[in-house]
Amino acid sequence: TQNKALPENVKYGIVLDAGSSHTSLYIYKWPAEKENDTGVVHQVEECRVKGPGISKFVQKVNEIGIYLTDCMERAREVIPRSQHQETPVYLGATAGMRLLRMESEELADRVLDVVERSLSNYPFDFQGARIITGQEEGAYGWITINYLLGKFSQKTRWFSIVPYETNNQETFGALDLGGASTQVTFVPQNQTIESPDNALQFRLYGKDYNVYTHSFLCYGKDQALWQKLAKDIQVASNEILRDPCFHPGYKKVVNVSDLYKTPCTKRFEMTLPFQQFEIQGIGNYQQCHQSILELFNTSYCPYSQCAFNGIFLPPLQGDFGAFSAFYFVMKFLNLTSEKVSQEKVTEMMKKFCAQPWEEIKTSYAGVKEKYLSEYCFSGTYILSLLLQGYHFTADSWEHIHFIGKIQGSDAGWTLGYMLNLTNMIPAEQPLSTPLSHSTYV
């Protein structure tokens, strides 16, 4: 009988991240008897939903059910049937839906209503679909990475669970880049958070945290590109836009109506004497960087210091995990190594952007052209945002760790969201039981 496997006493949870460009489903698993321990929840599956973000279904809401089917069926397969009814399902929508709601609360509500009805058809314990705030997105991302890094554990460990862990209890800041927004969240050093909107107070595992967070709507990589195009086309002399953020030889026709289809470009809107224009890449990092900087208003700051657009930002403190598109873009560009300095990153970006489009297409034949064409812009944007937007320097660059996964779980807001909604992060430190942290070993 000793060799007979005991039935696993585990629990599961599902979170759908309804982002601006796509939806991803995450399945989490944890030992039932260790719910309040830190670091025991881990991701067992990620399923990327085929198609765009849910906000794009506003004119075709009847297609949402089919859109979600494959990943929900995958969840049905991964999670044992006996667990289905007690597995909570949460859907959080982010900046794409925030933008749609700015346009019409009803339109956003209709989309969520159909999403809810679709998800209610599955055998899981559906807990609702909602648009999370930018503040929540930042906060839950911060909770996720620090939970996975073991920063909330009061146990001092002699070993390190991740390569960049410094084995102290100083939390990591969180840098999240999406398609439509970007978040910066960290614990400032003895600094008053001058704007109440950017201040969060947490008590986690018996310790108090005063956290700064801000979400910049319209400053995700996709919306930033639309902003830049809308800004630059204003001064174009004809329907050709010579763009330094695209590779030499790259050409793409853009509909003016698509350019103005987002609240993010409203400030640049004007009547143009053409319905379409052609982007012609010239591949110049420095000029691209300069163009991007024009999206950041740094001339106005009502506080002791600001990021941009008059938003308070305390002095940066400690190490930062940069995830989501920060990671995906830098990983593609092979710039995630801890050993690569900011100067080296800039040099490599200059070389990459200057490469002819035909050469790039040949070198990366397996990558979709739509994504491939935007890496020069996205990489340059990341540098501009981190250096000029958030005031990282060549010296503090080494404190940025580009993170995809920690302990097999994706860095992002979804895990933190589930931990919070399932009450798995206690305010007080739970009474320790022998071997309660054996899961780390």
Partner: antibody, heavy 123, light 106 residues
């Protein structure tokens, strides 16, 4: 002061076309969804078409779908309704109306209305 | 489409009295119900938005309530200028109006 002024109405034969215009002033036009609502003589209100602030959502009543086209020119602060294949039942006073807002979010209700322009379809 | 049914079609009330107008939606519209007043020869005027919110410049004697399918517009103490036609409108789906309630002097 918010003002909406419709023009372009008149008498037209069945099957013909007409283009209505709405000139807006007193607010930032491109921040608001715009609509056409009509009212047949002695009858109630009927929504015709909507154009959301960023053109994400453009919609038409079933009675006009395929015949009418809504458009806007944000630089000219103007809303338009191109009406083709007109029928006797399209005879109505056509109002231009602005979408309201719920705090920072757009709303599909109508907080300001013009005085209307009369369209009569008759042979 | 969502059909809006207003009742009564005509309501006769004396000045100073309370008037209660009803609107029923053929399916749930959450709180996305709005009320308008229209006087002869004039454009409609927004009174209440999202079931219970008073529009700018509208006197406090007007109030709205309800959610789902049943909604009410109440005028607490009728003034002479309140005699008009009242329309409800839902915005949960593409907008539809009720047929109107005519509020007339008793």
């Amino acid at each position: 002061e918010v003002q909406l002024v419709e023009s372009g109405g008149g008498l037209v034969q069945p099957g013909r076309s007409l283009r209505l215009s709405c000139a807006a002033s007193g607010f930032t036009f491109n921040n608001y969804g715009m609509n056409w609502v009509r009212q047949a003589p002695g009858k109630g209100l009927e929504w015709v078409s909507s154009f959301s602030s960023s053109s994400t959502y453009i919609s038409y009543a079933d009675t006009v779908k395929g015949r009418f086209t809504i458009s806007r020119d944000n630089a000219k602060n103007s809303l338009y309704l191109q009406m083709n294949s007109l029928r006797a039942e399209d005879t109505a006073l056509y109002y231009c109306a602005r979408h309201g807002r719920y705090g920072g979010y757009g709303g599909f209700y109508f907080d300001y209305w013009g005085q209307g322009t009369m369209v009569t379809v008759s042979s | 489409e969502i059909v809006m049914t207003q009742s009564p079609a005509t309501l006769s009330v004396s000045p100073g009295e309370r008037a209660t107008l009803s609107c029923r939606a053929s399916e749930g519209v959450k709180s996305y119900m709005h009320w308008y007043q229209q006087k002869p020869g004039q454009a409609p005027r927004l009174l209440i938005y999202k079931a219970s919110n008073l529009a700018s410049g509208i006197p406090a004697r007007f109030s709205g309530s309800g959610s789902g399918t049943e909604f009410t517009l109440t005028i607490s103490s009728l003034q002479s200028e309140d005699f008009a036609v009242y329309y409800c409108q839902q915005s949960w789906n593409d907008p539809t109006f009720g047929q109107g309630t005519k509020l007339e002097l008793k």
